[in-house]
């Protein structure tokens, strides 16, 4: 009763919301709510029933599965989604979903901060930029992996000759989508012209 | 907030008839069902009928039939009950009281504070 | 039409005291059936429905148990504010009908 299930998903794609297990058998209604208390649908063993809301017009109720599909969901969509049945025996049953939206993220910039040759090592400081975002950093020299503790949006790391790399590529994601930045210096310790 | 304010205290003729209103607010109206509940004085509840706001589908005591109606007005969220040819034993308190449900599941959530019917020649 | 008996049909009891109200139907209602509370000169109050289950907002000390025919409403440890007439009402068919009531009044 009321376990809750999480579901992330990318912003403007078609969600199915539905419960693992089968419905009880025979139920008498079924109702969907966002935020605890506004309806969405209502199943009443003749017909749904759409009511007023955000939702009118891109959901979709299944009576068979209780699944309720929604179009083209937004981030105003994040909420926590609750299934509710009432059974033949006059008992209700709920489950809950905690849908989140996340818009897919945008393309970073690197900005180079500073750049130095230092007795043969590169002293090198580089930051990586997205309008104000929840993602993570992942940095790669020529496509390898930086180490954990270097992984957040600014990079500052002072390279031996045997460690230089020519390009360097900050990788943000989120839990539904990721994208790339890539900045390449001349050897040893110069940005490449582009 | 969830609120249904029931219109004030009526006095009436035997044989007249009488319309008590509800007006919901704190919620989507068409979303659940109104019953309609009445309390004769020193007496227990009595259950008269159902309407849903969503498509006005109805159902009615049998002591009722014939003498009452059940409408709805979806523009200003408002259940109404009209009774006629009210005797004495019609005087009573009448609830609103909100189903769980659009379609009835007689399980009430919210009850309106009550108008009170007084029959009085 | 379903017919509900309640009993008592009033009860003495004092702050802090376990009190029990049970509730019959003339036929198997399985679990449908909902307790409301009433003060004078007031309105009904949800407090259970589907036998069991408490409608939001009420407190914990209030409960309600059984199935078919035979009902229970349980306060466990009486408040002051807990003094007033207690009804049960069957939900499983038209016509909803109620029992006659319970007070529960300060000894």
């Known amino acids: 009763q009321g376990h809750l299930v999480h579901m992330t998903v990318v912003s403007g794609s078609n969600v199915t919301l539905n419960i693992s297990e089968s419905l009880p058998e025979n139920y008498k209604q079924l109702t969907w709510f966002y935020t605890f208390d506004q309806k969405i649908v209502e199943w009443d063993s003749r017909k749904s029933k759409y009511f007023e809301s955000k939702f009118k017009g891109r959901v979709r109720l299944d009576p068979q599965s209780g699944a309720l599909y929604i179009s083209k969901v937004q981030k105003e969509d994040n909420s926590t989604y609750i299934m509710r049945v009432l059974k033949k025996t006059g008992n209700e049953q709920e489950w809950k979903i905690k849908l989140q939206v996340l818009d897919p993220v945008p393309k970073p910039v690197i900005k180079i901060e500073k750049i130095e040759d230092m007795d043969d090592n590169c002293y090198l400081k580089l930051s990586c930029v997205i309008p104000g975002e929840s993602v993570n950093y992942t940095w790669y020299g020529d496509k390898r992996p930086f180490p954990k503790e270097l992984q957040n949006s600014v990079l500052e790391t002072t390279l031996m000759p045997h460690n230089y790399s020519r390009c360097y590529t900050c990788q943000v994601s989120n839990s539904v989508s990721s994208k790339n930045g890539t900045v390449c210096l001349s050897p040893p310790c110069t940005l490449a012209r582009s | 907030e969830v609120q249904l304010v029931e219109s004030g205290a009526e006095v009436k003729k035997p044989g007249a008839a009488v319309k008590v209103s509800c007006k919901a607010s704190?919620?989507?109206?068409?979303?659940?069902?109104i019953s309609w509940v009445r309390q004769a004085p020193g007496q227990g509840l009595e259950w008269m009928g159902w309407?849903?706001?969503?498509?006005?589908?109805?159902n009615n005591a049998q002591k009722f039939q014939g003498r009452v109606t059940m409408t709805t007005d979806t523009s200003s969220s408002t259940a109404y009950m009209e009774l006629r040819s009210l005797g004495s034993d019609d005087t009573a308190v009448y609830y609103c009281?909100?189903?769980?449900?659009?379609?009835?599941?007689?399980?009430?959530?919210?009850w309106g504070q009550g108008t009170l019917v007084t029959v009085s020649s | 039409d379903i017919v509900m008996t309640q009993s008592p049909s009033s009860v003495s009891a004092s702050v802090g005291d376990r009190v029990t109200i049970t509730c019959r139907a003339s036929q198997d209602i399985s679990s449908w059936l909902a307790w409301s509370q009433q003060k004078p000169g007031k309105a009904p109050k949800a407090l259970i429905y589907?036998?069991?289950s408490l409608q939001s907002g009420v407190p914990s000390r209030f409960s309600g148990s059984g199935s078919g025919t035979d009902f229970t409403l349980t306060i466990s440890s009486l408040q002051p504010e807990d003094f007033a007439t207690y009804y049960c009402?069957?939900?499983?068919?038209?016509?909803?009908?109620f029992g006659q009531g319970t007070k529960v009044e300060i000894k």
């Open positions: 009281a909100r189903d769980r449900y659009s379609s009835s599941s007689g399980y009430f959530d919210y």
């Open positions: 309407i849903s706001a969503y498509d006005g589908d109805t």
């Open positions: 704190g919620y989507t109206f068409t979303a659940y069902g």
């Open positions: 589907a036998a069991s």
């Open positions: 009402q069957q939900a499983n068919s038209f016509p909803y009908t």
